[in-house]
């Protein structure tokens, strides 16, 4: 194994779970996967004297890297103190150190709610010269928060002087006011309240609504899939118009593009509807450099009896990226369906939401047909997620049992697609270079996460991971609500102690 | 090593039974599919069935020329495999393998018994 | 049943010497096809799977290509030990079948 340096992660406890009275603590500075050995461990107690005690590296199974803890038990007026753990380690470099300064314990919190209100606009619709937004961050514990305002994503240069804080109770309010011009408003760009808070980030976004449509009539325009994107590289947008009754004006839909460049030839499409109504379709081919570098393109319907054109644009989604992570199940025999079993990859903690999932069997790409995939929906943080499941003959997986989920997305590097291999008989599928399995171990902390059901093998544990109080077979003291895991993770021991 | 030897073949009249085994050792028997292919001298390899593993209710196949005659069973417990074969003809007469399929590719076979002689004559 | 046609039904070749022998399909099996080597007097040999993965063991001189209903087996630089009957397995379903066989005779 070549030279890894240590990844570090505090261990301390919640503070509810320590007695008002404890006249001593323990805490704890977890060093994983360096290799190789030794790692130097110090501590700096500041006025306060303390013992410590090193334990025996341990090896990860897999890796063959190594993983110890060093505990510090400390006396006295410790509640205030900040502690320091400072890790060397002398085969990455005779200067590779890191430090992590923490308190004796985690505190429960209330996270804040975020919402942005939007001044009125005049009676007659109309905006008025400036625009404010409020943003109220709203039923936290209180603490310190930062607030900041995005443009498109981009920080904005704002007064936050006049933000103001109150306390009801035991929770607090702040609330942050931002003013633009009318033109700024109007350019269609979106506004975010960014809130930072324990080390956690809270958000609302808003922009102006789409003018209100001529009644009963949509239009829609899609991005180009990341499929069509990064593998066939001939991506195309659409322009959906539903709803329109059929007459003997003809619905125009006129492409462009912001930068005024010309666009390429567009195909349309005219359906009629069960239900008597005309949907109209215009499919533009784009440039994968165009759409990539952000070239905004625009879609305007026009009908002799609409009252206004309606004008519909779409570009790259601005924001940050996050590459998917894939994880790939087989669902275990049922009774009466012995010949068919359940493939399920979940694909999670994406963004920007655009993502295109595919099926593959012994390399080639089962049809579009064969499986069936949610829509990206919001995690609890801030990336999506998808599920798609896919059912397969006994004749298939006995051709050969192993079946490729396949994420596109841009986040994904080096070539825009992650995949995961599942086999219906796992235990029998007898490895294979493709799997990108890590099974390793996964290190937990009690506290929130205490009494969750296990991690399902194959997915990320975090953050449903088990943890008991304390295990026999980890050699730390009990009170530290240390466990360790096998699970199947993206990578060796992960830290998943949210107190 | 993966090992596998047949035994139990012999010279039968025609409308006989005749029970094969095949005894295998270095891999783990449970595991695997297993099947019998057959070769009549100077002829080609005729599959002839194949018995799943626990895991998939060791269940079996046969080609059309020897459903309802010959039956595949397995002893998990002792790593054997054995052909049970019925109403034998003359054309049945060829030497029988024991073959291990693979894994993942459950249809594909890798490694072979040195084969057992059987001659179906009155 | 999927047919398996092989081709040439027998060659001779001379040591050092390359030979390719086809198998052909009567459906599109799309990769699942295996080649196995049997000496004079031995049982089967695994040379390839699912196509062009040379199984354990096999000399890299073997080498196999194909998809669809096309199949062939190039072996390089012809040994001596690689003279007897090469046979093609489809492992796409059930039944499995096998080819009629190549004789592969030093010349």
């Known amino acids: 194994a070549s030279t890894q340096s240590p990844s570090v992660f505090p261990l301390t406890r919640c503070c509810k779970n320590i007695p008002s009275n404890a006249t001593s603590v323990t805490l704890g500075c977890l060093a994983t996967g360096y290799f190789p050995e030794p790692v130097m461990v110090t501590w700096d107690t500041g006025s306060l004297n303390g013992t410590t005690m090193t334990l025996p590296a341990t090896t990860l199974t897999l890796s063959g890297h190594y993983a110890t803890i060093s505990l510090l038990t400390v006396s006295g007026a410790w509640a205030k103190q900040m502690f320091t753990c400072r890790v060397a380690h002398t085969p990455s470099s005779t200067d590779w150190v890191d430090n992590k300064t923490f308190s004796v314990c985690s505190r429960d919190f209330t996270p804040p709610t975020v919402k942005i209100l939007q001044s009125s606009c005049d009676g007659g619709g109309h905006f008025p010269p400036t625009i404010q937004l409020l943003c109220l961050v709203s039923g936290y514990t209180p603490g310190t928060i930062n607030i900041t305002w995005l443009e498109d994503g981009q920080v904005m240069d704002v007064d936050l002087s006049t933000a103001s804080t109150t306390q009801e109770g035991e929770l607090a309010s702040t609330q942050s006011e931002l003013t633009l011009s009318q033109k700024h408003w109007l350019s269609d760009r979106t506004y975010t309240c960014q809130v930072t808070y324990q080390g956690h980030t809270f958000e609302d976004s808003t922009k102006k609504c789409a003018d209100s449509n001529p009644r009963g009539v949509s239009a829609y325009l899609s991005r180009p899939s990341p499929f069509d994107l990064f593998i066939r590289k001939s991506p195309t947008i659409t322009c959906l118009v539903v709803d329109l009754a059929p007459s003997k004006g003809t619905v125009n839909l006129t492409w462009s593009r912001a930068s005024g460049k010309p666009v390429n030839h567009s195909t349309r499409k005219e359906e009629k509807q069960r239900n008597g109504t005309l949907t109209v379709t215009s499919t533009l081919p784009v440039g994968t450099r165009d759409w990539i570098e952000g070239e905004t393109y625009q879609c305007r319907v026009t009908h002799p009896h609409l009252p206004r054109a309606l004008m519909r644009s779409t570009t790259k989604t601005s924001g940050p990226r996050a590459a998917p992570e894939v994880y790939a199940f087989a669902t275990p025999e049922w009774p009466g369906s012995r010949d068919k079993r359940t493939l399920a990859c979940l694909i999670q903690n994406f963004m920007p939401e655009d993502i295109s999932v595919q099926w593959l069997h012994n390399e080639v790409q089962l049809p579009d047909a064969r499986h069936s995939t949610t829509q990206p929906r919001k995690t609890k943080g801030s990336g999506f997620f998808v599920f798609s499941r896919l059912e397969v003959t006994r004749a298939e997986w006995e051709q050969k049992d192993e079946f490729i989920c396949r994420a596109v997305h841009e986040a994904a590097s080096p070539s825009q697609t992650v995949q995961r291999a599942v086999s219906v008989n796992p235990g029998l599928a007898g490895g294979s270079a493709q799997s990108q399995r890590a099974p390793d171990r996964v290190l937990c902390h009690s506290g929130q996460q205490q009494g969750l059901p296990r991690a399902a093998g194959g997915s990320v544990p975090h953050p449903r991971c088990h943890c008991g109080a304390g295990r026999a077979d980890w050699p730390g003291p009990p009170e530290l609500d240390v466990c360790v895991e096998e699970a199947e993770g993206e990578a060796p021991w992960t830290w998943t102690g949210l107190c | 090593e993966v090992k596998l030897v047949e035994s139990g073949g012999e010279l039968v009249q025609p409308g006989e039974s005749l029970r094969l085994s095949c005894s295998t050792s270095g891999f783990t028997f449970t595991d695997y599919y297993m099947s019998w292919v057959r070769q009549p001298p100077g002829k080609a390899l005729e599959w002839l069935g194949f018995?799943?593993?626990?895991?998939?209710?060791?269940?079996?196949e046969y080609s059309t020329s020897v459903k309802g005659r010959f039956y595949i069973s397995r002893d998990d417990s002792q790593n054997i495999l054995y052909l049970q074969m019925n109403t034998l003809r003359p054309e049945d007469g060829a030497t029988y393998y024991c073959?291990?399929?693979?894994?993942?590719?459950?249809?594909?076979?890798?490694?072979w018994g040195q084969g057992t002689s059987v001659t179906v004559s009155s | 049943d999927i047919q398996l046609t092989q081709s040439p039904a027998s060659l001779s070749a001379s040591v050092g010497e390359t030979v390719t022998i086809t198998c052909r399909t009567s459906?599109?099996?799309?990769?699942?096809l295996a080649w196995f080597q049997q000496r004079q007097g031995k049982s089967p040999h695994l040379l390839v799977y699912d196509s062009k993965i040379l199984a354990e063991g096999v000399s890299s001189r073997f080498s196999g290509s194909g998809s669809g209903t096309q199949f062939s087996l190039e072996i390089n630089s012809l040994q001596p030990e690689d003279f007897g009957t090469y046979y093609c397995q489809h492992h796409y379903g059930i039944p499995l079948t096998f080819g009629a066989g190549t004789k592969l005779e030093l010349k």
């Open positions: 073959v291990r399929n693979k894994k993942v590719y459950y249809y594909a076979v890798d490694y």
């Open positions: 459906e599109n099996i799309y990769s699942y």
């Open positions: 018995i799943r593993n626990k895991a998939n209710s060791y269940t079996t």
